[in-house]
Structure formats: C-alpha cells, structure tokens
C-alpha cells in the first residue's frame, strides 16, 4: 500500500535569464528511494540513482545542475522553459510517486512591470 505523499514547490515563476530550483519531498513513507527522475512534459532532464548518483541528460548538460539534495537547478531560463515539470520517485517497495511543478518564465520587463504596478 502506498502511504507516501509528495510535497512540491507548486506553481512558481522566474525571470528569463535567471535560475530556479525545483524541489520535491517524499514524506509519510518508509519506502527506500531508488531513483528520482526529473522530467519536463515529454523530456527527461536528469536522474538521481541511489547507486550511480546524478546523471544529467546530455541535451541539458549546459543548463541543468544537480541539487540541492534531490532537487534540480535550471539555469539560463528561457520563455520556452515555461511548463510542467515532474519529479518521479521510484521507491521500494511502494512503487512510483509523482509530483508536479508548474514553472512560468517571465520576460524581465514583464516581471518588473508587474511588481511596479501591483494593486495593494
């Protein structure tokens, strides 16, 4: 029986050209985490395997950094990075847990404009 839950950073936003940390945390289970996959919609970004450690997809090696912890750091963000990200925890004996994060990458001017004209 799967008793665990995944907590994520939820919906987040960041500025174009900046960086962001994607974080998930598996709790309420004693299952052993054997691997975590980080995926963006239909693309595999990286894995952290209990035996082998981190492996970043070669397609993202220049913009993705492992950690902190089991999280993932995305760098040099572009508007095309906007979308859903998934942390997929492979565990034993529970099976697979999946968390979802939505990232919105904003043009710098848009982010500044929004901050400057916020309604109290």
């Amino acid at each position: 029986m799967m008793t665990g839950t995944i907590e994520t950073t939820g919906n987040i936003s960041a500025e174009k050209g900046g960086s962001i940390i994607l974080q998930c945390h598996l709790s309420s289970t004693t299952a052993q985490v054997t691997q975590v996959n980080w995926e963006q919609q239909d693309q595999l970004l990286a894995i952290c395997n209990a035996d082998l450690g981190w492996h970043i997809s070669p397609s993202f090696k220049d913009r993705v950094a492992p950690g902190p912890g089991l999280g993932l750091t995305l760098q040099s963000l572009t508007v095309n990075d906007t979308g859903e990200y998934f942390c997929i925890y492979h565990t034993y004996p529970d099976g697979t847990y999946t968390g979802r994060i939505f990232l919105e990458v904003l043009e710098s001017s848009v982010a500044e404009h929004g901050a400057r004209f916020q309604i109290p």
Epitope: E39, H55, S57, T96
Partner: nanobody
C-alpha cells in the same frame, strides 16, 4: 519493463576498434538517457558515455576523442564506437538506459579484452 541486449564485445589488439550495440525493447516510449558503463577486474563500475534522444552526448575524460556514442532512435539502439583501444580499456561493458517515467535498467554486459 525495458530489456537491454548488448553485443559486439570481443578480443582486439591494442590500437584496434570495436563497435558495441545496445538494443532496447519493451517500455521504450518517450525521451531517454542511454549510456555505457564499464567494470574492469577488481575495480568499481565506471561511467563511459551517455546519449539522449535529442542527440547530445557526454564522455568520461579518459575516452574522449577515441570513443563515440550514437543512437538510432527508430530502433531504440545505442552504439559505442571504440577506436584506438588500449589494454586499460579491458572491462565488461554494460549498457544502461532510462526512458521517460521509468527506472534505470541494465544490460547483461559484454566483455571487451584489449591484448596482443
């Protein structure tokens, strides 16, 4: 589940070449990271090279310029072209793959022996 079958190992003289193949079958949809690791007698398994569906690749420093990893996406097969082989390249070479949403899967290994 994903199954991996390696082939192409064997005995080769120093300076020679071999081409390893790793064919994936089963649950092979979506993006992937496929790669090669090796384990020499009495040593730990070490990373050699990886490739993604997008075509990017990474290598351990000791094989850069001598080994080339490639893939045929239509066949879900990865290749490792090994040139200018050295005695220290002698090892069991293992294919490994992760497909979208899936766990890491290992092949059974293929022995490469570099000796005169």
């Amino acid at each position: 589940e994903v199954q991996l079958v390696e082939s192409g190992g064997g005995l080769v003289q120093p300076g020679g070449s071999l081409r390893l193949s790793c064919a994936a079958s089963g649950r092979t949809f979506g993006d992937y990271i496929m790669g090669w690791f090796r384990q020499a007698p009495g040593k730990e398994r070490e990373f050699v090279a990886t490739i993604s569906r997008g075509g990017g690749s990474t290598y351990v420093d000791s094989v850069k310029g001598r080994f080339t990893i490639s893939a045929d996406n239509s066949k879900n097969t990865a290749y490792l072209q090994m040139n200018s082989l050295k005695p220290e390249d002698t090892a069991v070479y293992y294919c490994a793959a992760v497909f979208s949403r899936g766990p890491l899967t290992w092949g059974q290994g293929t022995l490469v022996t570099v000796s005169s």
